[in-house]
Interface confidence: medium
């Protein structure tokens, strides 16, 4: 089942998905003065078996100047620089994302695809988010959204997570900036802090994506 | 079940302090965000602060800015708002709320009244 | 600090009656706008987020929409327990801000 609604926008921040689960689609768009080639697939689609998960059909692109020209898909380094998907750039990838049952990885670009990706997703997808660079989160932990089916219409999680810009802070003399006491931030959780430097999703994260050992909402 | 529950509110004169406690139950408050949010009466509504989850990072509104601040502890799941200096028009209900993107749980509110 | 500008300031109304009340920003809030319930002597509810939004537990009558500057809660058929004022707020930027509040009341 498809989620009706993209992921919820929140104020200077973006989302990736660490994987993708079978159903989902991704648009095949071409960059301005390219056009899918005639007869080309419109979408990629994860599809997959028990074991193995993996995208059906091919994008391509072609120019727009040329009829029939078909250029082959090869992934060109050069375009991933140049590409402007809804993932951030995370210093560290799970490892074991393609692993995860039942999801794909992140496909690899096709020569002059647009710049921004657009992905159908379904029901159960999670994405996670993080502040952009010079805005920090007031919350702790990964924020998350879930793509869930209520009362046969699908929503998606609301994340915990403001961003609010570093020369917002109000600091007054005399006011010192607190130390988080153990009690309040124990060692095992500060690896999953959500700040504009730091998106470690560890790898038993992605691993346990089904069954959020995070809740989403809190109630 | 989400619970605030704010006290300390009261009588005050113009010129002096009052702190404001929130308790904070049912949820993982050292992972949260926190805020007040104030009412004059009959008026609308004004954001004050703002904390993140470990203190670190702190906002106020412009009205109150090195008059008021705000604090938490999170070994006691207690959200605070010291006020110095206060000024009649200070005058109203205060309400903790947990802080993301929307204000979800509230308190009660608590009145604080500057009158000499 | 972005202005939130609601209209109308009181609004008379029947239960049954399709009714709409407007929020104005003073700059874009890029659809990140809360809309709340107040009844008095209680602490105010939220009804919708991200303009269009519906909060958990609330009623299918209550609809928002916009974009840019100017935004709508709509609620299309009042209920007795509908009577309340209501408050946008934008949470684009700090400091977050609320409009003036919006009394609906029994006609």
């Known amino acids: 089942e498809l989620c009706d609604d993209d992921p919820p926008e929140i104020p200077h921040a973006t989302f990736k998905a660490m994987a993708y689960k079978e159903g989902t689609m991704l648009n095949c768009e071409c960059k301005r003065g390219f056009r899918r080639i005639k007869s080309g697939s419109l979408y990629m689609l994860c599809t997959g078996n028990s074991s193995h998960s993996s995208w059906d059909n091919q994008c391509q692109c072609t120019s727009s100047a040329t009829r029939n020209t078909t250029k082959q898909v090869t992934p060109q380094p050069e375009e991933q620089k140049e590409r402007k998907t809804t993932e951030m750039q995370s210093p560290m990838q799970p490892v074991d994302q393609a692993s995860l049952p039942g999801h794909c990885r992140e496909p690899p670009p096709w020569e002059n695809e647009a710049t921004e990706r657009i992905y159908h997703f379904v029901v159960g997808q999670m994405v996670y988010y993080q502040c952009v660079q010079g805005y920090r989160a007031l919350h702790r932990g990964p924020a998350e959204s879930v793509c869930k089916m209520t009362h046969g219409k699908t929503r998606w999680t609301q994340p915990q997570l403001i961003c609010t810009g570093e020369m917002e802070t109000s600091q007054f003399p005399g006011e010192e900036k607190p130390q988080a006491s153990p009690e309040g931030r124990p060692e095992s959780e500060t690896s999953c802090l959500v700040t504009t430097t730091d998106f470690q999703i560890q790898t038993e994260m992605a691993a346990t994506m089904e069954t959020s050992i995070f809740t989403t909402e809190y109630q | 079940q989400v619970q605030l529950v704010e006290s300390g509110g009261g009588v005050v004169q113009p010129g002096r302090s009052l702190r404001l406690s929130c308790a904070a139950s049912?949820?993982?408050?050292?992972?949260?965000?926190m805020a007040w949010v104030r009412q004059a009466p009959g008026k609308g509504l004004e954001w004050v602060a703002v904390?993140?989850?470990?203190?670190?990072?702190?906002y106020y509104a412009d009205s109150v800015k090195g008059r008021f601040t705000i604090s938490r502890d999170n070994s006691k799941n207690t959200l605070y708002l010291q006020m110095n200096s206060l000024r009649a028009e200070d005058t109203a209900v205060y309400y903790c709320?947990?802080?993301?993107?929307?204000?979800?749980?509230w308190g009660q509110g608590t009145l604080v009244t500057v009158s000499s | 600090d972005i202005q939130m500008t609601q209209s109308p300031s009181s609004l008379s109304a029947s239960v049954g009656d399709r009714v709409t009340i407007t929020c104005r920003a003073s700059q874009s809030v890029s659809s990140f706008l809360n809309w709340y319930q107040q009844k008095p002597g209680e602490a105010p509810r939220r009804l919708i987020y991200?303009?269009?939004s519906l909060q958990s537990g609330v009623p299918s009558r209550f609809s928002g929409s916009g974009s840019g500057t100017d935004y709508t809660l709509t609620i299309s058929s009042l209920q007795p327990e509908d009577f309340a004022t209501y408050y946008c707020q934008q949470y684009t930027s700090w400091p977050w801000t609320f409009g003036q509040g919006t009394k609906l009341e029994i006609k």
């Open positions: 991200g303009t269009n």
């Open positions: 709320t947990t802080g993301w993107n929307s204000g979800y749980d």
């Open positions: 049912g949820f993982t408050f050292s992972n949260h965000a």
């Open positions: 904390i993140s989850y470990d203190g670190s990072n702190k």
